[in-house]
Amino acid sequence: LKGQEFAPSHQQVYAPLRADGDKPRAHLTVVRQTPTQHLKNQFPALHWEHELGLAFTKNRMNYTNKFLLIPESGDYFVYSQVTFRGMTSECSEIRQAGRPNKPDSITVVITKVTDSYPEPTQLLMGTKSVCEVGSNWFQPIYLGAMFSLQEGDKLMVNVSDISLVDYTKEDKTFFGAFLL
Amino acid sequence: LKGQEFAPSHQQVYAPLRADGDKPRAHLTVVRQTPTQHLKNQFPALHWEHELGLAFTKNRMNYTNKFLLIPESGDYFVYSQVTFRGMTSECSEIRQAGRPNKPDSITVVITKVTDSYPEPTQLLMGTKSVCEVGSNWFQPIYLGAMFSLQEGDKLMVNVSDISLVDYTKEDKTFFGAFLL
Amino acid sequence: LKGQEFAPSHQQVYAPLRADGDKPRAHLTVVRQTPTQHLKNQFPALHWEHELGLAFTKNRMNYTNKFLLIPESGDYFVYSQVTFRGMTSECSEIRQAGRPNKPDSITVVITKVTDSYPEPTQLLMGTKSVCEVGSNWFQPIYLGAMFSLQEGDKLMVNVSDISLVDYTKEDKTFFGAFLL
């Protein structure tokens, strides 16, 4: 009974205490993207820096081939920011000419892939119409939430247009997850 | 071996169990900013409320002179939102007159200062072009991510134009960090 | 003294160790909103999905009648994203006609209600002027921060215009909280 003395009365037997510093964690940062083939009907996935600068993976959380691999089941906080940068498309002219059309947009999706399940699951989506008056525009989309993930799940970040992603600084575009 | 019985098999000796309520944490809220001198080539830092209303610091996480002081090494989740409020500048007219120029912008940076290291490190940046058609505009920039910080590190929030920060409500502009 | 051996030297007696998997947590996702009566001087509250798809509540964190109920006192990370979708209002025309007026806006507030306290407390606010040139527009507002909450507190998400909330996908509009 000794080790039990700090455990609250509703302590579950199957949920052992564990050191926080020992939990799977990762923070990945942007690199310059190269165009790659991606699945039809799915936005392209970003690839990431996982060890230089601010980036790290630890405690069995691994990064491979655009995916973060979930090493143990549990509730994770998952987040990403993507900074987009572009030039004004015809969007504003079309509108000023009085022909409202589908707006240009930028979208970020954090996607979960489970090998035993055929379809990826979209966990988080940030989507924004872009119809800027100015010539150059730039803006971030931030996402973050908690999800129950299973050992073996894989997480990736997809974007609507990979060529608009600002890859210039590690603090502008990033992706991370940590076990709660 | 008694105290070990709830520890998972991959428990590190150097990572002791610890009570969650005992971890360094802070949530700081906005106050009206006064113009101050700041370092050349660095955006000015915001100062903050640290004890009134929703604001607090606890468990040796201290706030002093615009900085949050990190009291122990570990992985921290760090976040901030800054709401900006402004009036339309000539930006939109310049563009409408067909002279595309560098856009006006608003930027938030969460910066880490390590005394032993000469240059501050930008942990997070949110930057957005502003070229509004309307007269008054307002909008938030939110940032949040996990970083490995060392005891003695100092965190601050820098903004591109301190006179545009919405200081009116503690829920609009804030800054926080907590040890995971 | 056996069970104490992993506890750091600043361990508080009143803060027992507890299993992380045992902490109150919830992630709620959007459903189609139905117009309901709401308090004067308060934005309408959203109601949520709490068990289907990505949504869950666990460890005594319950959802009832638009509120997340806080089952135990402590520091919680609370977050929400609301994606808004609309058509251009007269806003841009008013401005183009040279009559600058108060811009249209979209606002999200995470509110705490304490039964023993007459007034709700606004924990987080994201507010943005909307004056789009294009016809259709859509954009998210994301919020997240840490707060000290008491057992019995209730959390809700209020929005400035419930009819503009994008209810189409669970990854676009969501609300969550977890005990740290």
């Epitope: - | 101050t36 955006f43 009036m87 545009l164 | -």
Partner: antibody, heavy 116, light 107 residues
């Protein structure tokens, strides 16, 4: 200590131009806005315009065609240029700095007299 | 432009008196209402911003209140150094506009 000091006032002929300077110390112009306000003799205060930290400007629409506000961040100085002066432009001209909604710190002002 | 109407235009009072000055905006200014004090030969001073918040260094005898279009500056107990001209200013919409001023004189 925050200080704003205006200079460049004096007697100007009708139809002429003025260029007033506002030298600031204690803060950086690259990150704070500076407003210009004037006060005709025995009258109230009239807001003329602002230059924001990022360089954008706003003007009082009644005077916009005659006003230009500029700055030199390296000299920590803001300038107000006004053309086609008339007698009713006679006033004390102030620069002030603050947040987006209010002017926290003011200079002492410089008197501009438009007369032949 | 938003018109700011200040009243009274002048006011005589004695040391120790409680004094109230009002300011009315021609449209809702969302609490972005500021009060300034002006003395001859001195720089203008910001007293109160965002309706009711005291600027740093301003004595607590000064207070502000109001919402929507109607706002008030109150000096709870006049001191000799308070005799001056007071202006209100809206900071909600450009162009910023001022009231015409209230001259507070010794009775």
């Amino acid at each position: 200590e925050i200080q704003l000091v205006e200079s460049g006032g004096g007697l100007i002929q009708p139809g002429g131009s003025l260029r007033i300077s506002c030298a600031v110390s204690g803060f950086s112009l690259s990150s704070y806005g500076v407003d210009w306000v004037r006060q005709a003799p025995g009258k109230g205060l009239e807001w003329l315009g602002v230059i924001w930290g990022f360089g954008g400007t706003n003007y009082n629409s009644a005077l916009k065609s005659r006003l230009t506000i500029s700055k030199d961040n390296s000299k920590n100085t803001v300038y107000l240029q006004m053309n086609s002066l008339r007698a009713e432009d006679t006033a004390v001209y102030y620069c002030a700095s603050g947040n987006f909604d209010a002017m926290d710190y003011w200079g002492q002002g410089t008197l501009v007299t438009v007369s032949s | 432009d938003i018109q700011m109407t200040q009243s009274p235009s002048s006011l005589s009072a004695s040391v120790g008196d409680r004094v109230t000055i009002t300011c009315r905006a021609s449209q809702d200014i969302s609490n972005y209402l500021n009060w300034y004090q002006q003395k001859p030969g001195k720089a203008v001073k910001l007293l109160i911003y965002y309706t009711s918040r005291l600027h740093s260094g301003v004595p607590s005898r000064f207070s502000g209140s109001g919402s929507g279009t109607d706002y008030t500056l109150t000096i709870s107990s006049l001191q000799p150094e308070d005799f001056a001209t007071y202006f209100c200013q809206q900071g909600n919409t450009l162009p910023f506009t001022f009231g015409q001023g209230t001259k507070l004189e010794i009775k």
